[in-house]
Structures are given as C-alpha cells and as structure tokens.
Interface confidence: low
C-alpha cells in the first residue's frame, strides 16, 4: 500500500528459468512412399531453445519440410495462388506469401492444378494446417523453475523469490504454496482462465508476472514476490495478423554434395516473465 | 500531457514480431578450385534467427569460411602479423586479434609472405571487407509486423497495439497510416533518417521507440502507441570499437569422420523495440 | 544526488557485447574404445551464441553425450533408480529426473546393476560431475567489449558510453580506467569478490549494472555511466533447486539414414547488463 | 574437376526418335539444359528441367516433340526428341546450372558438354 513519506524506487531485476519435462510424439512419417505411425521421445534440449533472460520457448507443435534443396518448383496452391497459363505469373515478382521467387512460367504443381512456378527451397512448404490435438499436448505437465534476484541500488538492498528454507520439491499454489517457484506449465494457463489443450496448436505468449511490493524500512520490513499470470497473444486475432506464435528455423546438411534443409515451422508457448514493483523506504 | 491530479505508472510491456519477405543473392562461389556466379534465395529460416522478445535480427550481408578444421596453419597476414623467423612467433601466445594459438614457428602463407603458424579451426578466417554492395540488400523491402500488449497493473489496465478494425494488408506511414503496425525496413530507416543500403554492409542497430501516453481516465480516456525510429549504433566509431553489427555463428559437420564447421560471420540490422510511456489515473 | 526542482526521467538504454577469446581444451576422447588426450581451440563462434541485447553466455565448462539415437534403454542408476524386478518399473512413467518414458521392464544396466527401461534418447545421458577444472578456465582472459546507447526521450536527450577520445586497447579498472568499456571476464568476478575458476565449474549469472545518474541542466551538465559487478545466481542453492547455470543443447545428424544426435550440458557464465538511472532536468 | 558428357547422337530420317544422354561429374546442379546449335546459326534453347522431374520447360520449336527427365541417382539428363524434323539437325550441348532463375537464358549456365552431333535426313 502507498506510504507517501517512504522513497520509492524501482526494482532491477535478473531472472533464470529451467524446464523440465518429456514428451512422447505420434505421427504419421512418410518414407520412401509408405506412411507409418511414429513414436518419438522429446526432451528439453529437442523443444526448447537455449534463451536469455526473461523468456523461455516451449514448443507445441510442428510442420516439417523434409529435403528441401533450392531449385525451382511450383509454388504451393493455397487461395488465389493457381494459374492456368504463363500470363498470370510475373517473372521476378515475390508474393510476401509466398516462398520464392516467380521465373514467370506457369506449371503442374499436381494433376490437376497448376500454380506460378518459383524459384526457392523446393518442394515449397505445404500450407496445411497445424495438427490437431498438438504433438507435445503433454508439455501442460512440464514443469518451470524460475529464479529471480532483485535489487535496489538506491537503498542497496537485494533479495531473491528462493529462499533456503524453501522445499525443491513444491509446485505453486495459488493458495497452498504461493511463494513457490516451480510452476506446472498447465496450472499457469489454468490460472489464466485458459485451455492449454487449445492454445498448443497455434501457439500464443503467456505472461508470468512477479510484482516485489517492498517495505524496507526495518520496523515493517516486506519483500516478497506475488505472482500472477495472463494471457498476452490476441486469442481473436485476424488471420492477416498472424495469430498464436509461430517461427520457422532450419536444420541445414549435405547430402551427395547438394545443400539440403529440413524447415521446421515450430508453434509454442513464449513465456514473458515480466518483473516490477518497487522498494519503498523511509 | 501532464495532468497533476493523476497517479503515473509505467508500462509493462511484451512485444511479439514476425518478419517477412524473400531475397535472392547473387555471390561468387568457388568449388574445386573454379569460380562461378551462384544464385540463391534466402527466406525467413535463412536471414533470421529464432529470437525472443524485443529485439529482432535481419541478416543483410555475410562471410562465409567454409571447410574448416582443427589442426596447424599459418595465421591470416593482417597489418603487423607477417615474420621472417621463428623469432617472431611465440609459443602459446594468443593473439587478440588472432585465431588461434600460436605454435612459435614462422611459416609459409603463400608464396611472397609468411607468418606465424597457428592452431586454429584452419584455414584461417580471411579478414576481408563485408562485400559492397550487401549480398541481402533486398532486405529493405522485407516487411515486419509488431505486436505489443501493454499493462498497467495498478491501474488494472490492459490494450495491445493491433486494433480489430486494423486492416493486415497496411504498411505503416507517418503520415497516412500511423497507426499501421506492419512496417517497411526500408522506411524505418528513411524515418531514421539513414541509408539502408550503407548500413546493410556493416551491419547495425536500429531503435523502434513505441512511446504509450496513456490518460486512464473516463471521461478523457486516451490510450494508443506513438512510433518513432533511431539508429542506435554508432556510424562514426574508431574502427577498434568495432563498427556495425555482426556475429560469428557455425554450422558443424562431419566428413570422413573429421568434424569440420563453415563459419558464417553474419553482418546485419538488430532491431531494437523500446517500449516506454505512463499510465495516469485519478 | 537528488535535486528536488528537476523533473527526473528514467532511461531507455540499447545494449551491444562482443567477446573476445580464444581457448585451448584438452580433454579424454574416447574413440573406437580407445581413450586418448584429445586438444581443441574454441573461438567465440564455438562457446558463444547469437544473443540479444542485455545478456551475453560465454561457455565455460561441458559435458557431452555422443551419438544417441531413438530407441529402447535402461536409464541411469542414479540415485534411487535401480531395479530388481519389473514390478519396480511402471509401463508410461515419467520420471523428472530421468531422460525418458519407461516401458515397464527392469533390464541390465551394466555387469552389476539393473534399471528401469526407457524409450529414450540412447545411450542415456551419464549423470556425471561437470569436469574440474572447467574446461575453458581459460576464458578467464577473454574480453567483452558492451557499448550502451541510452536516450532520455522526454528530454529529448542521447547519449552512449563510449566517446569519440576512447582508446579501443583499454582495459576497464575501477580506479585507472572506470570509464573503459571493455572488460576482463576474470575482472569483473574479481570486482565482484568471486572467484572465476571456481564459478566456471559449474556456471553462474553475474550482472554488469550500468547506472546513469545524469544532470541534463546546461549549467552543470553530467552524464556518463557508472559501472559495478555482483553476482546474480544464488552460489549456496540447495541442489534441488539446480545451482550454476547450464542448458542442454544438440546437434542432429543422420548416419546410416538414422536421426543421431549429440547432447551438449553447457555450463557457463551468462552475464546481464543491467542499465538505471534517471535524467534529470530544471 | 566438373565434367559433362553428352551421347546417344547420330543419323536418323525424319519422323524417327532418339535419346540423348548426359552424364555429370564433379558437381550437381540446380537446372540442367539443353542447347543447340545449326550450322551458321546461334545457338538455342530447347529444354531444361530443375531438381523436381515435373519440373521441365521446353522451347517453342520443341514443345510436345521432345522431353526431358532426369534422374538425380545417376546424376544424369536425358532428352528423348520423337517425331524428328530436318530442321532439328545440329549439335546438342547439356549445360548445368547453379541459378535458379531465367533457366532459358545460356547466360547463367556455367558448366558445358563438348556437344553431340544431331543429323536428320529428309
């Protein structure tokens, strides 16, 4: 609460998280023309990313494109995107949707449809929808570690959410156990009035936000973290805004002297943990 | 303005980016030996790297070392690294400036000079200019999308740049769409008054300031970001401090079982998202 | 000091690092059974990462596990893990601690001890002690260069810690050379009274604060920055609570058509350079 | 060192068939062509196909005569020309490229065969 003759100042933060957890994947793969069912095993270093600072990445979701080679091919036929001869496609051009380049011809993408011929990382990425339920659904039972150290420099004073008496083996309660820090990834959404069943498809932000209201003066001295949590992506965002969270990186090899890539489009869970407050003293 | 009545706090503040576009680089490639033109095209997974926050890095130029190997090699012959004798060099002496340690022989490096022999990833990182122009100068027409959810929680107080009236097919103008959260590379730097195609060489960091003036009141609410842009490195500096902005990363791999890595010395723009503002009350 | 007829404006600050460092591992290599002293050079390109902006890592110390692939198991005996039976293993298990998901089967770990099985990334990781001494020690040498732009918005004020009059082979000292923005790692642990080889065992967070307490009035003008070091991680964490600082990260390859990959533990030094201070102005 | 080896030229009457080969070695390439050149003529383009095998274009003088395929195992191209006119007589050159685009210019081919003699009779 406000205590007008105290000095206030704001809080310096630094903050370290480590996840946990493991997630067992289903999916269909393709190879050499048969498709079967398979299981594999993720673990923090396969769908988190080594990150500073007051965020972490968990990912959800993926699309993969497999032995990708840069050539030219047929762009993928999404909405508006299929042509019927050389006219419609315009040499040089770059649609921002699109993956690559146009050479101005108009090509087969299958038997039945032909779209603008471009040159890029061939075949393009298929434009299918991410998959439904998530892959990594089960990282609602990963668990986070935070650790935050304050200061304030004005008054010299620091202090830390884990204390020694502190129990490594807790999970925060927003009634139960409050001060812990090692939080369940889908009590946080539960907190937040959301479903993570539903936001690991697209992906989307979540904030984690740890408010230091503290009394420093020595005859009433208080410092400790209260956490909340709220959602900070638009869960009703238009398509054209880009909804959820999303990012596409490469894994990059040879293969018979040719440069391949495999494109991954990763959906997840960005965790902002957004510290503030202030330390007040006479 | 400033309303004396009011009770001011600052932001919070999560900001969320996705940059788009395509660039096709045209480079000199060597492969045994003979020199050809080689054309590529870069796409996001390419120029851009998975990265929290506020801050994004679009890769306009770069250097590639490929094929190295751990062993023995004369270093680079920079200004001041040439020897005539074994004198010269010191055994065990790392060299700032250098690669690698030095192993106290004076060697060969082609057939008018010679210098101190290394170990280092081999052959050593040539120190040549950043090519001009840049190799991703297209990247002024690449395209990013800033989304940024603000709070003010003593004020219990909630927005986010994007609007849903907002139309996703804008681009941001000072004067004719302000408001407009997708913005042209090129025309951050035209705001900022720089040279997009200078810069590009070298690399360097650019400031996008939203500023939130925020009246929270009722009866005078008011509450929507002002963007403005600033180059935040320094054009001017002593080449010692290192001008620009780059980055060494590599790309490991093995052949006939030796581990070998192509270094890629990445010149580029970071771009820096700086949030700043209050929320007033009464 | 505080001057009560100015109005005070915190400060929006860009930061920018760069390592500089070499350093000569030696370490076991076990090849073909056969285990022999292996010695590498690590550039800033091996033990550091593309970051942004208010934190850089430098790679001090690692552990790797080679050449696992998805398959079947038995975990490692840890502490608490061994079996005697199936009945001790429970078929969808997940243990925290453990690198994968048993299959209900008590099997052989080695010649005198029996563990659960899991569907995991195999060979699972050996729970072993980080290498003492830390592998790069060495980094204790290495330089990091930070510059700082910082701007006070509405006082319409810029200004960076590095000067045109700066000499780029300085070195920061507290007393000979306080305004020199290039640091010694080993330096900073010093100023902070930490000991560098000790922390670079098992890695820690050390925070750089730059504070800027600046008069922007003409008549008295001041505004460079001040920097001091402290150390961030708790060094007297219960093991539980994970002390240090490390992540896991890997490399994937194919051999044979499989999906391989290479499990790095790095521990290291992140340090967070975290920038205050006010403008104030009549 | 990049070698490219063209063979399956010769004699043939018109309305006949034949297949060109082209073995590449030393390098792979994005776009593979064909080129030809009659006597006291400039040398034109008759085909290319990129990495995808549907990946094909022809030239206009060509266009449902002939086809390219390629098959990356055997780092190999193939130019099945039917229905051959006298007007096809010349000599057949492969060409590799590394570009990606403008694949019908000659231009941005780097890497040439010695070229096969195509003669068709009346």
């Known amino acids: 609460s406000d205590k007008l003759y105290q000095r206030k100042e704001p809080v310096i933060s630094s903050v370290h998280t480590k996840v946990k957890g493991i997630a067992e994947v289903t999916e269909n793969v393709t190879e050499g023309g048969v498709t079967k069912l398979g299981h594999s095993i993720f673990d923090t270093a396969d769908y988190t990313f080594p990150l500073q600072g007051n965020s972490f990445f968990v990912m959800t979701n993926y699309v993969k494109s497999e032995g990708q080679v840069q050539t030219l091919c047929p762009e993928y036929p999404r909405r508006g995107a299929q042509c019927s001869s050389d006219r419609r496609c315009k040499k040089g051009w770059m649609d921002p949707q699109s993956k690559g380049i146009q050479t101005g011809r108009c090509v087969p993408y299958d038997k039945t449809r032909k779209t603008c011929e471009v040159s890029a990382w061939c075949p393009t990425e298929e434009e299918k929808e991410a998959p439904r339920p998530a892959l990594l659904r089960s990282a609602e039972n990963f668990t986070v570690l935070i650790k935050n150290n304050i200061h304030f420099p004005g008054h010299n004073y620091t202090t830390r959410n884990i204390l020694p008496t502190m129990n490594g083996s807790c999970t925060f309660h927003k009634t139960w156990d409050p001060q812990c820090s090692i939080f369940r990834l889908g009590d946080i959404f539960q907190e937040a009035g959301e479903n993570f069943t539903e936001v690991a498809v697209q992906g989307g932000i979540m904030g984690i936000e740890i408010y230091w209201d503290c009394n420093l003066d020595s005859w009433s001295h208080h410092c400790r973290p209260r956490y909340s949590f709220r959602r900070l992506d638009d869960k009703n965002m238009d398509e054209s805004f880009v909804p959820g969270y999303n990012f596409r990186y490469a894994k990059y090899y040879k293969e018979n002297n040719v440069e391949k890539r495999t494109l991954i489009k990763a959906f997840g869970i960005r965790f902002d943990i957004l510290v503030f407050g202030t330390g007040g003293k006479f | 303005s400033d309303k004396l009545y009011q009770r001011k706090e600052p932001v919070i503040s999560s900001v969320h980016t996705k940059v788009k576009g395509i660039a096709e680089v045209t480079e000199n490639v060597t492969e045994g030996g003979v020199t050809k033109l080689g054309h590529s095209i870069f796409d996001t997974a390419d120029y851009t790297f998975p990265l929290q926050g506020n801050s994004f890095f679009v890769m306009t130029n770069y250097v590639k070392s490929e094929g190295q190997v751990q062993t023995l090699c004369p270093e680079y012959p920079r200004r001041g690294a040439q020897c005539s004798s074994d004198r010269r060099c010191k055994k065990g002496w790392m060299d700032p400036q250098s690669k690698g340690i030095q192993t106290g022989r004076c060697v060969p490096y082609d057939k008018t000079r010679k210098t101190c022999e290394v170990s280092a990833w081999c052959p050593t990182e040539e120190e040549k200019e950043a090519p001009r122009p840049a190799l991703l100068r297209s990247a002024e027409n690449f395209t990013v999308l800033i989304k940024n959810n603000i709070h003010f929680p003593g004020h219990n107080y909630t927005t986010r740049n994007i609007l849903p009236t907002m139309n996703g097919s804008c681009t941001f103008h000072k004067t004719w769409d302000p408001q407009c959260s997708i913005f042209r590379l090129g025309d951050i730097f035209q705001e900022a008054g720089e040279n997009f195609t200078e810069v590009a060489v070298q690399g360097g960091i650019m400031g996008i300031e939203i500023y939130w003036d925020c009246n929270l009141d009722s009866w005078s609410h008011h509450c929507r970001p002002r963007y403005s842009f600033r180059r935040l490195d320094d054009k001017n500096m002593d080449e010692s401090f290192v001008p620009g902005y780059n980055f060494r990363y590599a790309k490991y791999y093995k052949e006939n079982n030796v581990e070998k890595r192509t270094l890629i010395k990445a010149f580029g723009i970071r771009f820096d998202i700086l949030v700043f503002g209050t929320g007033g009350k009464f | 000091s505080d001057k009560l007829y100015q109005r005070k404006e915190p400060v929006i600050s860009s930061v920018h690092t760069k390592v500089k460092g070499i350093a000569e591992v030696t370490e076991n290599v076990t090849e073909g059974g056969v285990t022999k002293l292996g010695h590498s050079i690590f550039d800033t390109a091996d033990y550091t990462f593309p970051l942004q902006g208010n934190s850089f890592f430098v790679m001090t110390n690692y552990v790797k596990s080679e050449g696992q692939v998805q398959t079947l198991c038995p975990e490692y005996p840890r502490r608490g893990a061994q079996c005697s039976s199936d009945r001790r293993c429970k078929k969808g298990w997940m243990d925290p601690q453990s690198k994968g998901i048993q299959t209900g089967r008590c099997v052989p770990y080695d010649k005198t001890r029996k563990t659960c099985e899991v569907s995991a990334w195999c060979p699972t990781e050996e729970e072993k002690e980080a290498p003492r001494p830390a592998l790069l020690r060495s980094a204790e040498n290495f330089t990091v260069l930070i510059k700082n732009n910082i701007h006070f918005p509405g006082h319409n004020y810029t200004t960076r810690n590095i000067l045109p009059t700066m000499n780029g082979s300085c070195t920061f000292h507290k007393t000979w050379d306080p305004q020199c923005s290039i640091f010694r790692l080993g330096d900073i642990f010093q100023e902070a009274g930490e000991n560098f080889t000790e922390v670079a065992v098992q890695g820690g967070i050390m925070g750089i604060e730059i504070y800027w307490d600046c008069n922007l009035d003409s008549w008295s003008h001041h505004c460079r920055p001040r920097y001091s070091f402290r150390r961030l991680d708790d060094k007297n964490m219960d093991e539980s609570f994970v002390p240090g600082y490390n992540f896991r990260y890997a490399k994937y390859y194919k051999e044979n058509n499989v999906e391989k990959r290479t499990l790095i533990k790095a521990f290291g030094i992140r340090f967070d350079i975290l920038v205050f201070g006010t403008g104030g102005k009549f | 060192e990049v070698q490219l080896v063209e063979s399956g030229g010769g004699l043939v009457q018109a309305g006949g068939s034949l297949r060109l080969s082209c073995v590449v070695s030393?390098?792979?390439?994005?776009?593979m062509g064909w080129f030809r050149q009659a006597p006291g003529k400039e040398r034109e383009f008759v085909a290319t196909?990129?990495?995808?095998?549907?990946?094909?274009y022809y030239g206009d003088s060509v266009k449902g005569r002939f086809t390219i395929f390629r098959d990356n195992a055997k780092n190999t191209v193939y130019l099945q020309m039917n229905s051959l006119k006298p007007e096809d007589t010349a000599v057949y050159y492969c060409?590799?490229?590394?570009?990606?685009?403008?694949?019908?210019?000659?231009?941005?081919?780097?890497?040439w065969g010695q070229g096969t003699q195509v003669t068709v009779s009346s």
């Open positions: 196909v990129g990495w995808n095998p549907m990946n094909s």
């Open positions: 060409a590799g490229s590394g570009s990606l685009l403008d694949v019908t210019s000659e231009a941005v081919y780097t890497d």
């Open positions: 030393g390098r792979t390439f994005s776009a």
